[in-house]
Structures are given as structure tokens and as C-alpha cells.
């Protein structure tokens, strides 16, 4: 015998209290598949979460994060704060990148500057907290008659050493 509830479409539930009639989901609830015996409560996007998609009778609300935060986890279950370029998120909040490292995004960690000398190249543009160094042509390319040139060390700020 076919289950009468299987005829209830998405957006309804099979109401046992009313002879298994298909009843519409109450306000602020939904059923995304047919044959459901209950409707699920809609997710509420509150506080640092904001509504990206309103709940309907057939689909849950979807949240994202307010400006200054970004989503983490399945379905944006968490909001993590953004940092500025030149910073990384630590356990104690946003902190500037240490000398010799950079971050060009609002999330993620500070990464070491490229070591141009490893590729036999020179530093064309010094690195900053926000930007990686730009490597130029190899010193040999700049002095055509030279047979061997020791690549210069990466540029450093005076009085600083990499941390």
C-alpha cells in the first residue's frame, strides 16, 4: 500500500493530526523535499550574520556575514573577521605582518617575501607588508661582459632583521 504522505510535495508536511492531509508549512518553516512529516524551522540570520536568501516554504534561508567579516564552515556557519592587507589574523586579533613577510589579502596568513637570489635574480622592487618583492633580471643579464656575478642579498630595512 502506498504511503499517503508520499504525495505531499515540498513546502508541505503530512499532518497526522488531520488524517495525513498535506498541510502547508507554517510561517518561518520549510520542507525541501516531498513526503515530510514535519517542516524544519528556518535559519535566522542575526547579529554578524545577514540574510543572503530569504527562507521560503521549500528552502531554508541562507546567511552570509556583515562587512568586515567572511564566512567559514558549511553554509556559512561562522563569521571570521577580516584583517587589513599587511596583517594576519591571530588568536589575539589582527596583527601586522613581521618584517620579511606580506599579506595582500584580507584573510590568510603573512607569507615570506620571495627570495630572488634563489633564482639568481636581483630585487627590482622591495617588499612591503602588503606586497611581495618584485624580482628583476639576473645580475648577469644586466652586465653582459660579466662571467660570474654573486647575486645581491634581498633588500632589508636598516636596523631590522627578519623575524
Amino acid at each position: 500500500l502506498q504511503d499517503p504522505c508520499s504525495n505531499c510535495p515540498a513546502g508541505t508536511f503530512c499532518d497526522n493530526n488531520r488524517n495525513q492531509i498535506c498541510s502547508p508549512c507554517p510561517p518561518n518553516s520549510f520542507s525541501s523535499a516531498g513526503g515530510q512529516r514535519t517542516c524544519d524551522i528556518c535559519r535566522q540570520c542575526k547579529g554578524v550574520f545577514r540574510t543572503r536568501k530569504e527562507c521560503s516554504s521549500t528552502s531554508n534561508a541562507e546567511c552570509d556575514c556583515t562587512p568586515g567579516f567572511h564566512c567559514l564552515g558549511a553554509g556559512c556557519s561562522m563569521c571570521e573577521q577580516d584583517c587589513k592587507q599587511g596583517q594576519e589574523l591571530t588568536k589575539k586579533g589582527c596583527k601586522d605582518c613581521c618584517f620579511g613577510t606580506f599579506n595582500d589579502q584580507k584573510r590568510g596568513i603573512c607569507r615570506p617575501w620571495t627570495n630572488c637570489s634563489l633564482d639568481g635574480k636581483s630585487v627590482l622592487v622591495n617588499g612591503t607588508k602588503e606586497r611581495d618583492v618584485v624580482c628583476g633580471p639576473s645580475p648577469a643579464d644586466l652586465s653582459p661582459g660579466a662571467s660570474s656575478v654573486t647575486p645581491p642579498a634581498p633588500a632589508r630595512e636598516p636596523g631590522h632583521s627578519p623575524q
Epitope: E88, L89, T90, K91, K92, K95, I109
Partner: nanobody, 124 residues
């Protein structure tokens, strides 16, 4: 599959205590540092506490120092957070989180797996 399952949340009065648990599976628990991170209703994620893989090193956010205690039982693959002298500011969803290495500190934010969270509400 790596999984973290929190429990122990609930409604508690100001000044009360709760103990959160997090059961881990799918990885060698003792090889990794673990953390508790919380999200209050109006705020972003806030790191609460971390513990090294062996349990020998623990770290706390200033806001919970002296009130919360993190511990772990590696034989049971379980992480704990004992929360005492709770205040309304501790109301949040508390997430158990796996760090990417055995060691930990109170600086590097190195989380690669999150639990589903357990809700703690402190209200009279």
C-alpha cells in the same frame, strides 16, 4: 573522515558553571593541538583557549583566564572546557577546533577542522 562533536552546552545562570566536551574521530587525536573558539551573537569568532597534543601546554584568552580550564583525555579522544563564574558575555556558540600541528601557542591561528558548535546561554 575527520569529525569533531561538541556537547555540554545549555542555559546557565550568571556565576554558574558548565563543562563542554568534544569527541574527535578520524585522526590521531594526541598528535594535534586543539582549541575552543566561540562566536557571540553580535560578534565574530573569538579564540578562547588552546592545548598542545600532549596536554602539557595550555593557553587562554585574557577574557577567560582564571575562569576557564582546557584539558584533554587522549585515551578517550576527548577535549574539555570547564567554564566557571560564567557571565552574560560568555553567551555564545562554542566550537571545538583541530589545529594543524602538535604544538600550539596564543598567537598563531592554525585551525583546519571545526566542529558543529554547542550553544551556551548565560542568563537569569
Amino acid at each position: 573522515e575527520v569529525q569533531l562533536l561538541e556537547s555540554g552546552g545549555g542555559l546557565v545562570q550568571p556565576g554558574g558553571s558548565l563543562r563542554l566536551s568534544c569527541t574527535a574521530s578520524g585522526f590521531t587525536f594526541s598528535n594535534y593541538a586543539m582549541s575552543w573558539v566561540r562566536q557571540a551573537p553580535e560578534k565574530g569568532l573569538e579564540w578562547v583557549s588552546s592545548i598542545s597534543g600532549s596536554g602539557g601546554s595550555t593557553f587562554y584568552a585574557d577574557s577567560v583566564k582564571g575562569r576557564f580550564t582546557i584539558s584533554r583525555d587522549n585515551s578517550k579522544n576527548t577535549l574539555y572546557l570547564q567554564m566557571n563564574r560564567l557571565t552574560a558575555e560568555d553567551t555564545a556558540v562554542y566550537y571545538c577546533a583541530k589545529e594543524g600541528s602538535n604544538g600550539t601557542d596564543d598567537y598563531h591561528y592554525d585551525i583546519d577542522v571545526w566542529g558543529q558548535g554547542t550553544t551556551v546561554t548565560v542568563s537569569s
